[in-house]
């Protein structure tokens, strides 16, 4: 018994005066607590606790279940204990089969012994299976067997407490270890869509998926810069042992413009927190914005190809797209496709492929697109660079020789006279009148130039060349004169020579 100094409160004394007592099943247990301020006896084994207010604890016929710690406490709160083993060959273990272990922590397999003198107190796998190689344990006959640093891999491990009695191995009832995982990473959060675009009155519904090792992960939807509690609904699933999924769905049944903003799905566990955001934009009506990918004024050489390309944003989805030229709709030569296959995509591309353009195909090409709310259009002015074409070459009633040429850029007309039957026209003739005409006849983009010279200046047989040229090329036409007496006569224009 402990010795104490006089005057100081001392713990009670117990008879018999030893720390451990072994009795046989059926024998009497008699324990006496001596203390002037005796309060109570307490008996503890596993989760069971009993009290006795008498200073002598008597169990007439001891059973294995009377094995445990008997503690006497006085009025000063001081106590003394004795551990009693009730040896029962038929019941070597007292068991509490509930067995939970937190990952990376120690856990106790509660199978205290009724006989401390048995040997080889340890753990064994069920049905003869070996225990995991890395499983370490410490046996304690009074408490059970402590498994050190529980691993996630031990989850659902079936095991027995085991002792050797008289050379034979005796097993306890089986235990199933349930491992509670430790949070070793932040929760994984994802959102059904990163952004939402809605019209007023439409329903906004967004789902956040939270994944973690257990259901004790916390999650909530928050609106950035707002403390308002949001209405959310939950669904959850366990996919296997350490794969928990929760879906938190936020709904606004009739969205308004002022509901626009950033919504955050927040989740945390003991390791840390994670979040993901989605952006809601609510517009009062749909829209279409068109962005030309090339200059809307296009210069292209005769015979070359050009692609007219636009990108456009359309919400709601575009319903009708068309390319128009000269009030006629293209049925082919164009394609329209979404910029991305993303479900929330509102950006589209339309391409008109113009191949081997002719000078007559310059003009305004218009892209039109509409959805249920709006229409939009963009026009491209296409100028086809063409070498001059001589439209007409006439001798007028007033004696003028008139040459009209069309091309782009604007042609220049020069005049030359070749006397007699010479092949080379070198003597230049100054025009009397040069005009750039309004292009009502030839198509858009071509510029028409009309130049005139006075044919009365020519006194000899010969050929007059009208030469039209620009940056792209040159073209000539010839007018042949022959004099018959005093009359000047035009003779067959292509009979004189080939230019």
């Amino acid at each position: 018994q402990p010795s104490v100094s006089p005057g100081e409160p001392s713990p009670p004394s117990i008879h018999p005066g030893k720390s451990d007592l072994i009795v046989r099943v059926g024998d009497e247990i008699r324990l006496l607590c001596t203390d002037p301020g005796f309060v109570k006896w307490t008996f503890e084994i596993l989760d069971e606790t009993n009290e006795n207010k008498q200073n002598e604890w008597i169990t007439e016929k001891a059973e294995a279940t009377n094995t445990g710690k008997y503690t006497c406490t006085n009025k000063h709160g001081l106590s003394n204990s004795i551990y009693v083993f009730v040896r029962d060959p038929a019941k070597l273990f007292l068991v509490d089969r509930s067995l939970y272990g937190k990952e990376d922590n120690d856990t106790l397999v509660r199978c205290p012994l009724t006989d401390p003198e048995v040997t080889n107190y340890s753990l064994k796998g069920c049905q003869g299976k070996p225990l995991p190689k890395d499983l370490r344990f410490i046996p304690d006959p009074k408490a059970g067997i402590m498994i050190k640093s529980v691993k996630r891999a031990y989850h659902r491990l079936c095991l027995h407490c085991s002792v050797d009695q008289e050379g034979k191995s005796v097993l306890s009832e089986k235990f199933i270890l349930k491992v509670r995982p430790a949070f070793k990473a932040v929760p994984v959060v994802s959102v059904s869509k990163a952004s939402y675009l809605l019209r007023e009155g439409e329903e906004f519904t967004v789902t956040c998926t939270i994944k973690d090792v257990s259901s004790s992960v916390y999650s909530t939807w928050k609106r950035e810069n707002s403390q308002t509690k949001l209405q959310e609904k939950y669904n959850s699933w366990h996919h296997g042992d350490f794969n928990y999924e929760r879906q938190a769905t936020l709904t606004i049944s009739s969205a308004r413009v002022n509901d626009s903003g950033v919504f955050m799905c927040y989740a945390n566990n003991t390791f840390g927190s994670a979040n993901v955001t989605t952006t809601l934009e609510v517009v009062d009506k749909g829209f279409i914005n068109i962005f030309p990918m090339i200059n809307t004024t296009v210069f292209v050489n005769d015979g070359e190809n050009v692609d007219l390309i636009v990108e456009y944003e359309a919400f709601p989805k575009p319903e009708h797209q068309q390319w128009i030229y000269m009030n006629r709709t293209f049925t082919d030569k164009w394609e329209d496709y979404p910029k991305s296959e993303n479900e929330s995509n509102i950006r589209y591309v339309s391409e008109l492929h113009l191949t081997r353009l002719k000078g007559t195909e310059g003009g305004t090409y218009t892209f039109l697109v509409s959805n249920s709310d709006v229409n939009a259009a963009i026009a491209f002015n296409v100028y086809v660079n063409t070498k001059p074409e001589i439209l007409t070459y006439d001798r007028l009633v007033n004696g003028m020789l008139q040459c009209v040429a069309a091309g782009f850029p604007e042609p220049t007309i020069d005049w030359y006279f070749c006397p007699g039957t010479e092949q080379r026209c070198s003597a230049s003739v100054l025009p009397v009148d040069v005009q750039t005409l309004n292009s009502s006849g030839p198509p858009f983009g071509k510029l028409v130039v009309q130049s005139s010279i006075d044919s009365s200046a020519f006194k000899h047989n010969g050929t007059v060349e009208c030469k039209a040229y620009n940056d792209v090329g040159k073209t000539s036409a010839y007018f042949n004169f022959a004099f018959k007496g005093n009359n000047k006569e035009q003779i067959h224009p292509h009979t004189l020579f080939t230019p």
């Epitope: 005769d302 015979g303 002719k358 000078g359 007559t360 063409t386 070498k387 074409e389 001589i390 439209l391 007409t392 070459y393 006439d394 001798r395 007028l396 009633v397 007033n398 009209v404 009502s440 006849g441 030839p442 073209t475 000539s476 036409a477 010839y478 007018f479 009359n487 000047k488 006569e489 035009q490 067959h492 224009p493 292509h494 080939t498 230019p499």
Partner: antibody, heavy 122, light 108 residues
Framework: QVQLVESWGGVAQPGRSLRLSCAAS????????MHWVRQAPGKGLEWVAV????????YYADSVKGRFTISRDNSKNTLYLQMNSLRAEDTAVYYC???????????????WGQGTLVTVSS | SSELTQDPAVSVALGQTVRKTCQGD??????ASWYQQKPGQAPVLVIY???SRPSGIPDRFSGSSSGNTASLTITGAQAEDEADYYC???????????FGGGTKLTVL
């Protein structure tokens, strides 16, 4: 000598298509603009279309614009007229004709083919 | 207006002179050309420019112009001259050629 020979015309139902061709010889085909002119039964001459000497430019009468296409193949010395969405009023003898002045698109027509009859009737 | 107007029919005694006329605004500036068309045949150019004849066209055919009127004259008409005659000129406000309605010449 200059010769222009049109292909056989034929009968077509309204809304259908027909293609005429005109084979040229006796001159430098690639130097001259070529025209199509038509003449409805018992009526006068009506200019239809022209293609410039190199085929880079085409012009049409308002009555056929958007339905008829003139083209040429200088390597084959052949002129074509593709007639789509035919109407009863397109019934006529179709002549191909050569421009008189080398390199000039519009002007007098100095040689004509013998003509081919196109009948549009249901 | 881009129209050329011709008398529908003219007759002439064999060997006499006949004049066919063509009226239109474009003729104030541009010369008319004239085409002869016999039944079942293609048109043939007979006069172009101020008064020019393609090779093979007899010199009894001549052209003239005054104001908005162009004329085709046959001096000493022959039986083979019986045909339809079309005048042709540049369209005002355009470049293509337009044709008159045609004159039917009968040689008596």
């Amino acid at each position: 000598q200059v010769q222009l020979v049109e292909s056989w015309g034929g009968v077509a139902q309204p809304g259908r298509s027909l293609r005429l061709s005109c084979a040229a010889s006796g001159f430098t085909f690639s130097s001259f603009a070529m025209h199509w002119v038509r003449q409805a039964p018992g009526k006068g001459l009506e200019w239809v279309a022209v293609t410039s000497y190199d085929g880079s430019n085409e012009y049409y009468a308002d009555s056929v614009k958007g339905r008829f296409t003139i083209s040429r193949d200088n390597s084959k010395n052949t002129l074509y007229l593709q007639m789509n969405s035919l109407r009863a009023e397109d019934t006529a003898v179709y002549y191909c004709a050569k421009a008189m002045v080398r390199g000039v698109t519009f002007g007098d027509l100095d040689y004509w083919g013998q003509g081919t009859l196109v009948t549009v009737s249901s | 207006s881009s129209e050329l107007t011709q008398d529908p029919a003219v007759s002439v005694a064999l060997g006499q002179t006949v004049r066919k006329t063509c009226q239109g605004d474009s003729l104030k500036s541009y010369y008319a050309s004239w085409y002869q068309q016999k039944p079942g045949q293609a048109p043939v150019l007979v006069i172009y420019g101020e008064n020019s004849r393609p090779s093979g066209i007899p010199d009894r055919f001549s052209g003239s112009s005054s104001g908005n009127t162009a004329s085709l004259t046959i001096t000493g008409a022959q039986a083979e001259d019986e045909a339809d005659y079309y005048c042709c000129s540049r369209a005002t406000g355009g470049y293509h050629r337009i044709f008159g309605g045609g004159t039917k010449l009968t040689v008596l």
